[in-house]
Interface confidence: medium
């Protein structure tokens, strides 16, 4: 009925967060028994999203208050029998509208989870739930889809023309003719003999009776064909039986007369001449999590939800555990980021699926003419002259090891290095002393630094 800041919780905030107009959506999720939040995230009994969503416009400086919610029902179709005990999860989502909203367009404002016990066919139960600073007022009920009846919607009841031991308005149940449909809680004052109800708080008349409480016999009324009440002396205190008398519209539909006949305006989710057909169409917004609804323009054509990546189920209500497909190889851990999968690889492996073994020469080549060497369960690159690093991708500084002896100057060259020797020395690394008498040069003792061997840079 309303959603907003709870009482006495400091400065009240608006659900729109002072960022312009917004819409609130409510996602209702039903789980069996006690909700096992950690292990079971599926809405196994069913899920639905609110569809009647007004836009709330907030003006700066305006004090925040609870937003009134539209009367549109959130209808959650459930499969199989109604369990009676269930976990109810209601998520309140805010969609921020407008170009300058800033931040994410969708935010989960509140999530209330609670265990409930509820028999089908009972009256509306009211509830108030607080979570964080928010407060949600709502009502809920469970009802069976005809022909199912009973507190668990487990029995099928079909109208039978044969007489039964059931009371007026209570249909026998097939295949249990000795059992009768449990009566609903009808509108107060509804005639127990001549009225009945399929919904709480309604009063539908048996043939031959009319009036809001089914207390007026149609056959004895002298105003049978009168379209307006006659004078009091005639005893016609109520209008005669027009097309809408007795409320021919089921499931809360509203009746209007149209040229001697009637027309039912059905609530969302119900269809047919008398709103007797229940079904969901794309107009109901049955696809969650951004699913695209196709078909289902009318109740006779089924809708299909085309789910976005990461979701499945007839209504895209189930998050796919894509990691359950074990996409990561070599013991990598899988992360489902929603928009993508990512693998956290063990050390020694790489690639989107950890498919590359970094300790395997077959897995990756060494750059710049380097050679891969395997050994001891690991691999390394033996790099060509002038290159270094794990994959030989780094250009080496051949002069870094000070290879020129006896004060020779080192110059890097595309093919390696060149030493410019100090006076009195010669050789590739200035390792030979020149004898003044013209005799052969001899290796000179190192001066200060050890003579560097000509080596490849590893």
């Amino acid at each position: 009925h309303s959603f907003g800041p709870g009482p006495g919780l400091g400065t009240p905030r608006s659900p729109c967060n002072a960022r312009g107009p917004c819409r609130l959506f409510f996602r209702v999720c039903l789980k069996p028994g006690v909700s096992q939040e950690a292990t079971e995230s599926l809405c196994a009994l069913g899920a639905a999203l609110s569809t009647s969503v007004p836009v709330y416009t907030e003006h700066p400086g305006e004090s925040a208050a609870a937003l009134p919610l539209p009367d549109g029902l959130v209808r959650v179709p459930f499969r199989d029998a109604w369990p009676g005990t269930f976990s109810l999860v209601i998520e309140t989502w805010r969609e921020q509208l407008g170009e300058h909203a800033g931040g994410p367009a969708w935010n989960l404002l509140a999530r209330v989870v609670g265990r409930r016990r509820l028999a089908a066919g009972g009256p509306w139960a009211r509830d108030v739930q607080r979570t964080g600073t928010w407060e949600l007022h709502f009502s809920y009920r469970a009802r069976c889809e005809p022909p199912a009846v009973g507190a668990a919607c487990a029995r099928l009841c079909r109208s039978r023309s044969a007489p039964s031991r059931c009371g007026p308005g209570l249909r026998p149940c097939t295949p249990f003719p000795d059992e009768c449909e449990a009566p609903s809680v009808c509108r107060p004052g509804c005639s127990p003999e001549h009225g009945y109800c399929e919904e709480p708080d309604e009063c539908r008349c048996l043939e031959g009776w009319t009036g809001p409480l089914c207390t007026v016999p149609v056959s004895t009324s002298s105003c049978l064909n009168s379209r307006v009440p006659g004078p009091a002396s005639t005893g016609c205190l109520l209008p005669g039986p027009g097309p809408c008398d007795g409320n021919p519209c089921a499931n809360g539909g509203s009746c209007s007369e149209t040229s001697g006949s009637f027309e039912c305006a059905c609530p969302r989710g119900f269809y047919g001449l008398r709103c007797e057909v229940s079904g969901v169409t794309c107009a109901d917004g049955p696809c969650f999590n951004g699913g695209l609804c196709v078909g289902g323009e009318d109740p006779d054509s089924a809708y299909v939800c085309h789910c976005p990546p990461g979701f499945q189920g007839s209504n895209c209500e189930k998050r796919v555990d894509r990691c359950s497909l074990q996409p990561c190889q070599n013991g990598g851990l899988c992360l489902d980021l929603g928009h993508a999968l990512r693998c956290r690889c063990r050390a020694g492996f790489a690639g989107p699926r950890c498919e590359h073994d970094l300790d395997d020469c077959a897995g990756r080549a060494c750059a710049n003419g380097g050679t891969c060497v395997e050994g001891g369960g690991s691999r390394r690159c033996s790099c060509a002259l002038g290159f270094g690093g794990r994959d030989c991708r780094e250009r080496a500084d051949p002069c870094a090891s000070r290879p020129c002896a006896h004060g020779g100057r080192c110059y890097a060259h595309f093919s390696g290095l060149v030493c410019a020797c100090a006076p009195g020395y010669m050789g590739v690394r200035c390792e030979f002393a020149v004898r003044p008498d013209g005799a052969d040069a001899v290796p000179a003792a190192p001066r200060g630094l050890r003579q560097a061997d000509p080596q490849r840079f590893l």
Epitope: Q326, C328, Q329, G331, L333, C334, R346, A347, G377
Partner: antibody, heavy 119, light 107 residues
Framework: EVQLVQSGAEVKKPGASVKVSCKAS????????MHWVRQAPGQRLEWMGV????????NYNQEFKGRVTLTVDTSASTAYMELSSLRSEDTAVYYC????????????WGQGTTVTVSS | DIVMTQSPDSLAVSLGERATINCRAT??????LAWYQQKPGQTNKLLIF???TLQSGVPDRFSGSGSGTDFTLTISSLQAEDVAVYYC?????????FGGGTKVEIK
């Protein structure tokens, strides 16, 4: 010395849950992943799942259909394995095993915890 | 899931003789196979990983070979302390799966 010390034997009724602990010592707990493996009487070893204690990211064996939950308490250097909706065939020895995360898989194992499920 | 099949189920070998255990995978696991030793009252011990790499501290009489789908664990000279059950395990992809085990005894 690397050690994994597991909690004591448990006897549970069908439908109940069991939580087995594995206390690690002798290494940096958050630097190594932790596997859980079980072995039913006379059966082969069965991998249940693995968790990264640094952020609790876990991968599970889908055979267990959401019945297994792996958690860690990094302050106590302890890993936990909880198995719910127990049935008689869950009677087994449950092991925790450290993952070196380099190339070797499970390089150190706990001594095992016997879980008996019986009505 | 990858199914690992070990053979034989049990093996009796004389002291000092060679013991050979085979392990086959239902699909290629490259070289990613580990071998474990299980003894009563002791923690399980990793012997070999990546098909042939000996785990630190394991005697070199243990060796592993093979790749793809067929692998072998060899104990070149069986010692009394090698009496145990040996398991192979693929560590190529999750869920990790184990072989059925081979019981090694002394003849």
């Amino acid at each position: 010395e690397v050690q994994l010390v597991q909690s004591g034997a448990e006897v549970k009724k069908p439908g109940a849950s069991v939580k087995v602990s594995c206390k690690a010592s002798g290494y940096t707990f958050t630097s190594y992943w932790m596997h859980w493996v079980r072995q039913a009487p006379g059966q082969r070893l069965e991998w249940m799942g693995v968790i990264d204690p640094s952020d609790s990211l876990a991968n599970y064996n889908q055979e267990f259909k959401g019945r297994v939950t792996l958690t860690v308490d990094t302050s106590a250097s302890t890993a936990y394995m909880e198995l719910s909706s127990l049935r008689s065939e869950d009677t087994a020895v449950y092991y925790c095993a450290r993952d070196s995360t380099v190339v070797a898989p499970m390089d150190y194992w706990g001594q095992g915890t016997t879980v008996t499920v019986s009505s | 899931d990858i199914v690992m099949t070990q053979s034989p189920d049990s093996l009796a070998v004389s002291l000092g003789e060679r013991a050979t255990i085979n392990c086959r995978a239902t699909k290629s696991i490259s070289k990613y196979l580990a071998w474990y030793q299980q003894k009563p009252g002791q923690t399980n011990k990793l012997l070999i990983f990546s098909g042939s790499t000996l785990q630190s501290g394991v005697p070199d009489r243990f060796s592993g070979s093979g790749s793809g789908t067929d692998f072998t664990l060899t104990i070149s000279s069986l010692q009394a302390e090698d009496v145990a059950v040996y398991y192979c395990q693929q560590h190529h992809e999750y869920p990790y799966t184990f072989g059925g085990g081979t019981k090694v005894e002394i003849k």
